[in-house]
């Protein structure tokens, strides 16, 4: 037999809170347990589900959980079934609702002295108790012409008067909790002696020196009073006007007229209506003086054909808000089409070259009109006027390569030399029309040049090869003065280049022929054995067919090259003694001797009393000091060549003689003794 150890029992539950209906079963065999609600099986949901044999509620719902629950245990083998006792919930809840008009049927029927009933639609279980409020203040029964009835759910005002006007709300509380009205009711019962607005003044914007009119009307029984005030609380009447409102008129119907408005008249005007009873009603309106500022400048725009572009016109600041429109060629643009106005924007769809020109944005209001032009250029792909041509440019002269194109806007032209962008410098110049000028053409300028002409619409490019026409020139130019060593073999080279390989020959300047021991071998003058007679002036002549001839004059000197007869030797001198460095050279022309000491030339005119250079070239230094030590170089030179030889000078302390040394023993190193 199936036995219920625990059975579900009826219980109190709170809306939205947890609950549990217990059920425990004992049986000899396996049983399965399920629940019924009002006889129908209960399906598990996230909110309500079986927990073991019990039924668990995550949040009790007063609608879905009302009814009778029963726990059922069934033995599927024997078919035996047992049912528990019935259980139900006493669900406690409270739910907010609006304050509604119960009587009369509509707000339009509410008149002074009629009965008005309001109902508070807050419901709950157990039934809540209600509290009414007007403008947030609690109302209690039996207080100034109102009753709270039907278990305080209804509020009756009898008779309703202006003093009952206000915002009505209600709150309710029960064992479950508290709720307040979700929507409140505004009761408005006019007191005919109170001033009521019939016509309120509106803000006005007027142009300077124009007129402004403010309308203002109130109604009441008896008729209310009406007064106008300006900003500073100055009353405006037809009898007493403040100085700055001389041109103000107040009409019998309450309207205020201001003529020839000036900036000082701008401000807040207050219209005050006062009934026999009730508070004054103050209405405000502002008088603005119309104004319009200047428009910002447009930058010129460049568009490409076929594209769609927009130009936004920012309206100038102004009061009232200025209206904006676009014009082209004096004609206002339409609001549709290919070129049209959309809002404040100028729209150009599928741009054509013919769309280029000046477009004007206009802005206007009461204060006047402003306009601003925008220049629209429709860019075109450059086209050639003159492409760069393969050119032969003369060395040493300016060379020009054209790259003349036309487009809108003016195209940008850049040049490349061997794929490297060319800068403007002392040798290259790019004119604004695209022409490249090479200021002084050099042989290595012979290469490829490419120019590119571009606009926002596209680019074109072309290249040209430059061939440099070499000028006829000596490479290198022969030295104008040269020396040959007497009685030796000598050569004087002369070479030249040109557009064609030049022929080179030598001749004596006096026109006489070269002696037989002197040969001219492809531009090299060869002296087998130099004689005194070989000295003189010679001319190297380079010539070719197209370029003629060039000449280089060379004066040859025959010389006996320098040799040293006496060379300075490594010398060691005692401090305070005199050093003599000998040097003698020979050659033709007779060489001059100069000395260099410690890396500087010894100027004979600035040697001072301790040093002297003799006629024969020897250098003497008196009273030597340690700082005189170093390398001394004898330099012998003439107009043909230069030779040098050097030796070190050591300055040492004089040793103190030891007793073992006799007076005749020699010093340990070579000395000059004075």
């Amino acid at each position: 037999a199936i036995v219920f150890i625990k059975q579900p029992s009826s219980q109190d539950a709170l809306q939205g809170r947890r609950a549990l209906l217990r059920c425990e079963v004992e049986a000899p065999g396996p049983v399965h347990v399920y629940w019924l609600l009002d006889g129908a099986p209960v399906q598990d949901t996230e909110r309500r589900f079986a927990q073991g044999s019990s039924l668990s509620f995550a949040a009790v719902d007063r609608l879905q959980d009302s009814g009778t629950f029963q726990c059922v245990a069934r033995d599927d083998v024997t078919g035996e079934e047992a049912r528990s006792a019935n259980a139900s919930f006493n669900i406690k809840w409270i739910e907010a609702g609006p304050v509604v008009l119960k009587h009369p049927a509509s707000e339009a029927e509410i008149q002074p002295q009629t009965q008005v009933t309001l109902r508070c639609h807050i419901d709950g279980h157990p039934r809540p108790t209600y509290q009414w409020f007007r403008d947030g203040t609690p109302l209690s029964d039996g207080q100034s012409n109102h009753t709270v009835s039907s278990k305080e759910r209804n509020l009756t005002l009898r008779p309703a008067g202006p003093e009952h006007s206000g915002l009505y709300s209600c709150c309710a509380h029960s064992a479950f909790g508290q709720a307040c009205s979700s929507q409140n009711f505004t009761l408005s019962i006019a007191d005919e002696s109170f001033a009521r607005v019939v016509l309120a003044p509106q803000d006005v914007v007027v142009a300077r020196y124009e007129e402004a009119m403010f309308h203002c009307q109130f109604s009441a029984q008896p008729p209310p009073s009406l007064q106008w005030l300006f900003e500073d609380e100055t009353p405006i009447t037809n009898r007493s006007r403040p100085p700055h409102l001389r041109r103000a008129t107040v009409f019998a119907n309450g309207s205020l007229l201001l003529t020839q408005v000036r900036p000082r008249n701008a401000g807040i005007y207050r219209c005050i209506g006062q009934g026999q009873r009730g508070p004054p009603i103050i209405l405000e309106a502002t008088l603005h003086l119309a104004e319009i500022e200047d428009m910002p400048l447009f930058e010129p725009r460049v568009f490409t054909a076929g594209s769609e572009e927009r130009v936004t016109c920012l309206p100038p600041k102004g009061l009232p808000e200025p209206s904006v429109w676009w014009e082209h060629a004096g004609v206002r643009l339409p609001t549709h089409g290919r070129v049209y106005q959309k809002g404040h924007e100028l729209v150009l769809a599928n741009i054509a070259e013919s769309d280029a020109g000046v477009y004007t944005c206009h802005a206007a209001n009461l204060a006047g009109q402003r306009r601003q032009d925008v220049n629209i250029t429709v860019a075109t792909v450059p086209s050639w006027l003159k492409k760069p041509q393969d050119s032969q440019l003369e060395e040493g002269k300016p060379g020009y390569l054209d790259c003349l194109t036309q487009a809108t806007p003016k195209p940008t032209v850049v040049w490349y030399r061997n794929q490297m962008l060319i800068s403007e410098d002392s040798r290259f110049e790019v004119f604004k029309n695209g022409t490249l000028r090479i200021n002084s053409v050099e042989v290595y300028d012979g290469t490829w040049y490419r120019c590119m002409s571009s606009t926002p619409a596209g680019s074109i490019e072309a290249q040209a090869r430059v061939q440099v026409l070499e000028k006829l020139k000596f490479t290198p130019p022969p030295q104008p003065q040269q020396c040959m060593e007497f009685d030796k073999e000598a050569t004087v080279p002369c070479s030249a280049t040109g557009r064609e390989k030049p022929t080179i020959k030598w001749e004596r300047a006096d026109g006489s022929s070269l002696p037989e021991w002197v040969t001219d071998n492809a531009g090299t003058l060869h002296f087998a054995r130099v004689t005194r007679d070989d000295a003189g002036n010679y001319t190297c002549i380079a010539s070719n067919g197209p370029q003629g001839q060039i000449r280089a004059h060379v004066q040859l000197t025959v010389a006996v090259f320098i040799t040293f007869k006496v060379e300075p030797e490594r010398t060691t001198v005692y401090q305070g003694h005199t050093a003599l460095l000998q040097c003698e050279a020979q050659g033709d022309p007779k060489p001059l001797i100069q000395w260099k000491g410690k890396d500087r030339i010894l100027d004979p005119t600035k040697l001072g009393p301790r040093m002297h250079i003799f006629q024969n070239g020897s250098l003497v230094i008196h009273d030597v000091a340690p700082e005189d030590s170093g390398r001394y170089t004898c330099i012998a030179g003439n107009s043909c060549n230069i030779k040098h030889t050097e030796a070190p000078l050591y300055v040492v302390d004089k040793p103190v003689p030891e007793e073992s040394e006799g007076p005749g023993s020699p010093p340990p190193y070579k000395m000059i003794q004075t």
Epitope: E299, P300, K410, V414, E424, D425, F431, K432, T435, S454
Partner: antibody, heavy 117, light 111 residues
């Protein structure tokens, strides 16, 4: 060689106008664009605008539109910059420069304009 | 207008070391396959001198220790090795579109 020689320093009163000149030698200004650049004391560089002396076509930076006017006289190979209604903010060195393409390789030595009451 | 932001505003570099100055454009300065970004050097009392044109090309007579790189919106000027004579103000400048604009400048000094 290419040279841009600018006029000497100017000391001006606020509200006055001044005309600066830039005389070119070593080239014909008709072949190039001439630019003007402003540099306030110890400040950066501001591009004023450029002129094509051949046809007088000009382009200005928005900040200088209306405040500066560029002109050129091809017969004297000279460009001019007119500054009107001077204020202390116009105290600066003004440079003229030359381009054939889009990089300024040659500059004048500059003209100092001082605006002081 | 294209705004150029240069950094740093000032820089001190030891002799022989590398100096790097950056310049960022508010939009690309590339056009026709060329980056229209140029670099100038300016010494007190002198006009600016063109160092680098079209982002990476050396101006006439500019020593090889000055080099430029970059494309689109990000560019840099490199000086290596730094020499005494390089103490100056350096400006980037775009010539892609009018108005041509300059960076705020970088003051380069010897550390």
């Amino acid at each position: 060689q290419v040279q841009l020689q600018q006029s000497g320093a100017e000391l001006m009163r606020p509200g006055a106008s001044v005309r600066l000149s830039c005389t070119a030698s070593g080239f014909d200004i008709k072949d190039y664009y001439l630019h003007w650049v402003k540099q306030r004391p110890d400040q950066g560089l501001e591009w004023i605008g450029r002129i094509d002396p051949e046809d007088g076509d000009t382009e200005y930076a928005p900040n200088f539109q209306g405040a500066a006017t560029m002109t050129a006289d091809t017969s004297s190979n000279t460009a001019y910059l007119h500054l009107n209604s001077l204020t202390s903010g116009d105290t600066a060195v003004y440079y003229c420069s030359r381009t054939g393409t889009r990089w300024i390789a040659y500059w004048g030595q500059g003209t100092l304009v001082t605006v002081s009451a | 207008d294209i705004v150029l932001t240069q950094s740093p505003a000032s820089l001190a570099v030891s002799l022989g070391q590398r100096a790097t100055i950056s310049c960022r454009a508010s939009e690309s300065v590339d056009n026709y396959g060329i980056s229209f970004m140029n670099w100038f050097q300016q010494k007190p009392g002198q006009p600016p001198k063109l160092l680098i044109y079209a982002a990476s090309n050396q101006g006439s007579g500019v020593p090889a220790r000055f080099s430029g790189s970059g494309s689109g919106t990000d560019f840099s000027l490199n000086i290596h090795p730094m020499e005494e004579d390089d103490t100056a103000m350096y400006f980037c400048q775009q010539s892609k579109e009018v108005p041509w604009t300059f960076g705020g400048g970088t003051k380069l000094e010897i550390k």
